[in-house]
């Protein structure tokens, strides 16, 4: 799998999960979150050559089409596969609220 | 939805499903399919700006990150959402076989 275990410990050029830290205030303009101040969101990047973690029959077809038609604008794209939630704390008045923000962290990628 | 109904009848520049015809022999090197000779596979293309059919909380966060950090390499990507099967005919000896190839046709796209 193109997950953090593999991708963070390799110099993989093809589609893989990459490290990205997001600061809530600076990068999103989110000022309501008390903790954490930011988080490791990660992102997916890299080309999707034929037979590289292709998601569906269609993405296999498209990658093969690309091999036969170099320079075509139709190509699979490296996108998140497994996403994880992020627990956050914010305040309403003086009362802390703990929430899980779903689908916030990329753990692995795929070619779709 | 960024489907064929909307995308094929508009000049949408953002993420949308685009027309693509694939010839099995010429474009894929598949010589085993008797009918059809090719099919309208379609593909997804176009930028994924903020508030544009974003798939998950993560893709919204990433698009917002992009707005606060222009030129960042981390950005959502336009990929297939709804896929449909394609019925094909091929021969085993002189005997025709009809099969459904699943996930072969793109009907709509999303930003992931």
């Amino acid at each position: 799998a193109l997950d953090t275990n593999y991708c963070f410990s390799s110099t993989e050029k093809n589609c893989c999960v990459r490290q990205l830290y997001i600061d809530f205030r600076k990068d999103l303009g989110w000022k309501w979150i008390h903790e954490p101040k930011g988080y490791h969101a990660n992102f997916c990047l890299g080309p999707c050559p034929y037979i590289w973690s292709l998601d569906t029959q269609y993405s296999k077809v498209l990658a093969l089409y690309n091999q036969h038609n170099p320079g075509a604008s139709a190509a699979p794209c490296c996108v998140p596969q497994a996403l994880e939630p992020l627990p956050i704390v914010y305040y309403v008045g003086r009362k802390p609220k703990v929430e899980q923000l779903s689908n916030m962290i990329v753990r692995s990628c795929k070619c779709s | 939805a960024l489907d064929t109904n909307y995308c094929f009848s508009s000049t949408e520049k953002n993420c949308c499903v685009r027309q693509l015809y694939i010839d099995f022999r010429k474009d894929l090197g598949w010589k085993w399919i008797h009918e059809p000779k090719g099919y309208h596979a379609n593909f997804c293309l176009g930028p994924c700006p903020y508030i544009w059919s974003l798939d998950t909380q993560y893709s919204k966060v990433l698009a917002l990150y992009n707005q606060h950090n222009p030129g960042a390499s981390a950005a959502p990507c336009c990929v297939p959402q709804a896929l449909e099967p394609l019925p094909i005919v091929y021969y085993v000896g002189r005997k025709p076989k009809v099969e459904q190839l699943s996930n072969m046709i793109v009907r709509s796209c999303k930003c992931s």
Epitope: W30, W32, V92, S102 | Q67
Partner: antibody, heavy 122, light 108 residues
Framework: QVQLVQSGAEVKKPGASVKVSCKAS????????MHWVRQAPGQGLEWMGW????????NYAQKFQGRVTMTRDTSISTAYMELSRLRSDDTAVYYC???????????????WGQGTMVTVSS | SYVLTQPPSVSVAPGKTARITCGGN??????VHWYQQKSGQAPVLVIY???ARPSGIPERFSASNSENTATLTIRRVEAGDEADYYC???????????FGGGTQLTVL
């Protein structure tokens, strides 16, 4: 494309109730909070509250608590806002508006309905 | 309850720059959103989370937010920009969403 279509104009007498509907299309109804905002003639925007279409949970502005009820019918992707004990100063255009993010209290509204005029007059 | 103060009106000549302010106690510590409302129409989101711009909103629209004032800036103003503009924040004390009183932008 993504849109919110609201019910038609209403004329009500003081003390009565009004129920405005907001039908969503082009997106997953349960994936976004729905807010209600009103605007009296010649006045500014006033937030009334939100409903989580997924759970039915609500959060009403302090000013409207006890008078407003927000509900939804997920089978027809429709949100409702009912305001009771109407007064003449409730005369306003009532808008439904989609919250863009999920579980983000400081969120904004990316899609708005066309508005429903409610007139309260004896 | 948190109060947002906007000037009732701002006038600007075509092609010039319009600046609409939104004042609030320590507003720089809050996320600000801006809406444009043309006569007889529903509001439209023009700036999100201080300075993000939804697709379809021209680059002429920008915003900033620090200390006690948030500002919406419209460069090279056009006749079509004539509208009411509202700022909005979340009041964490009351858990309410709060709008400013609105500013009517007139293009001379």
């Amino acid at each position: 494309q993504v849109q919110l279509v609201q019910s038609g104009a209403e004329v009500k007498k003081p003390g009565a109730s009004v129920k405005v509907s907001c039908k969503a299309s082009g997106y997953t109804f349960t994936g976004y909070y729905m807010h209600w905002v009103r605007q009296a003639p010649g006045q500014g925007l006033e937030w009334m509250g939100w409903i989580n279409p997924n759970t039915g949970g609500t959060n009403y502005a302090q000013k409207f608590q006890g008078r407003v009820t927000m509900t939804r019918d997920t089978s027809i992707s429709t949100a409702y806002m009912e305001l009771s004990r109407l007064r003449s100063d409730d005369t306003a255009v009532y808008y439904c508006a989609r919250s863009f993010l999920w579980l983000v209290p400081s969120d904004a509204f990316d899609i708005w309905g066309q508005g429903t005029m409610v007139t309260v007059s004896s | 309850s948190y109060v947002l103060t906007q000037p009732p009106s701002v006038s600007v000549a075509p092609g010039k720059t319009a600046r609409i302010t939104c004042g609030g106690n320590n507003i720089g510590f809050r996320s600000v959103h801006w809406y444009q409302q043309k006569s007889g129409q529903a509001p439209v989101l023009v700036i999100y989370f201080d300075r993000a711009r939804p697709s379809g909103i021209p680059e002429r629209f920008s915003a900033s937010n620090s200390e006690n004032t948030a500002t919406l800036t419209i460069r090279r103003v056009e006749a079509g920009d004539e509208a009411d503009y509202y700022c909005q924040v979340w009041d964490s004390d009351s858990d309410d969403l709060v709008f400013g009183g609105g500013t009517q932008l007139t293009v001379l």
